[in-house]
């Protein structure tokens, strides 16, 4: 399956979403920190990123939870995380990012 990411809000700041199995979904902010945000932002071509929490509830799937990156990974998929769709979160806990060049 092809996977991609997007920011919902402005071009560089807002809710972090991932595309998996034909559907856009959100990331739970459990364990979500700047190391994870840096990797997410790098996937969009940015060099810096910082984590945001409770940025406004999304809808649909919550695809990822307990994402734990070192910050050196090239994609989120290389980071430790729960299996796709496995979480104990609500959309009130949707993670966000602010990315920067």
């Amino acid at each position: 399956n092809s996977v991609s990411v997007r920011i919902v809000g402005s071009s560089n700041r807002g809710r972090a979403e991932v595309y998996y199995s034909g559907t856009w979904g959100t990331i739970c902010d459990d364990e979500w920190d700047n190391s994870d945000a840096i990797v997410f932002c790098r996937m969009l071509g940015y060099s810096k990123g910082r984590a945001l929490s409770s940025v406004g509830a999304g809808t649909g799937q919550i695809w990822l939870d307990n994402v734990q990156c070192r910050g050196t990974e090239s994609t989120l998929w290389s980071c430790t995380k729960n299996s796709w769709g496995h979480h104990d979160c609500s959309h009130e806990e949707d993670a966000g990012v602010e990315c920067s060049v």
Epitope: D30, K48, R50, S53, S54, V55, E98
Partner: antibody
């Protein structure tokens, strides 16, 4: 308009303890990260502590780590700062400030501040 | 810690003029920078975040620019209520740090 009202300041002796409170109103307190920032007399602003909306994450400046504890009670719309082993260099105006979002973020609303004086 | 060096410390200008305040970071902070306004008997106000994004309620005569280590706050066509103290603040890494402030006074 967001309101943040600090209380609990005063004059204390070095080595003693104090607990500051910040009562929030006119916004959904439980959705936002909260911070304590201080300003010593004739000095600049110093961020000292942050707590996430759900209390899951707390961060501190090195100058207060191990001595100060940030906490919150979302049912009471109240932020706290418990200060132990106070030193003269902790003398400052203490402000609570709301984050733009639920965790670490820019400070979009500030209280008027409460003065803490540590002196013998 | 990231050191934030703000200049000038004092600035005198007249209503209607334009002024610029500089803020330099000791390392690259991307665009993770905010500007605040401090006025007596008022609570501190967030003016600009993410380097250049105007906070809701900030007049359009305020603008922010820069990235990396060099940032500028510009106020065009100064109004009487703009005379205040201005601070920059980095939000790239803990601990969040502030500039020492610029006091904008009426000439």
């Amino acid at each position: 308009e967001v309101q943040l009202v600090e209380s609990g300041g005063g004059l204390v002796q070095p080595g003693s303890s104090l607990k500051l409170s910040c009562v929030a109103s006119k916004f959904t307190f439980s959705n936002y990260g909260m911070n304590w920032i201080r300003q010593a007399p004739k000095k600049g602003l110093e961020w000292i502590a942050l707590i996430y909306y759900n209390s899951n994450n707390k961060y501190y400046a090195d100058s207060v780590k191990g001595r100060f504890t940030i906490s919150r009670d979302n049912s009471k719309n109240t932020l706290y700062l418990e200060m132990n082993s106070l030193r003269s260099e902790d003398t400052a105006m203490y402000y609570c400030a709301k984050s733009l979002t639920g965790g670490s973020d820019y400070f979009d609303s500030w209280g008027q501040g409460v003065m803490v004086t540590v002196s013998s | 810690d990231v050191q934030m060096t703000q200049s000038p410390s004092y600035l005198a200008a007249s209503p209607g003029e334009s002024v610029s305040i500089s803020c330099k970071a000791s390392k690259s902070i991307g665009t993770f920078l905010a500007w605040y306004q401090e006025k007596p008997e008022k609570t501190n106000k967030l003016l600009i975040y993410s380097g250049s994004t105007l906070q809701s309620g900030t007049p359009s005569r305020f603008s922010g620019s820069g990235s990396g280590t060099d940032f500028t706050l510009t106020i065009r066509n100064l109004e009487p209520e703009d005379f205040a103290v201005y601070y920059c603040q980095q939000h790239d890494e803990y601990p969040f740090t502030f500039g020492s402030g610029t006091k904008l006074e009426i000439k």
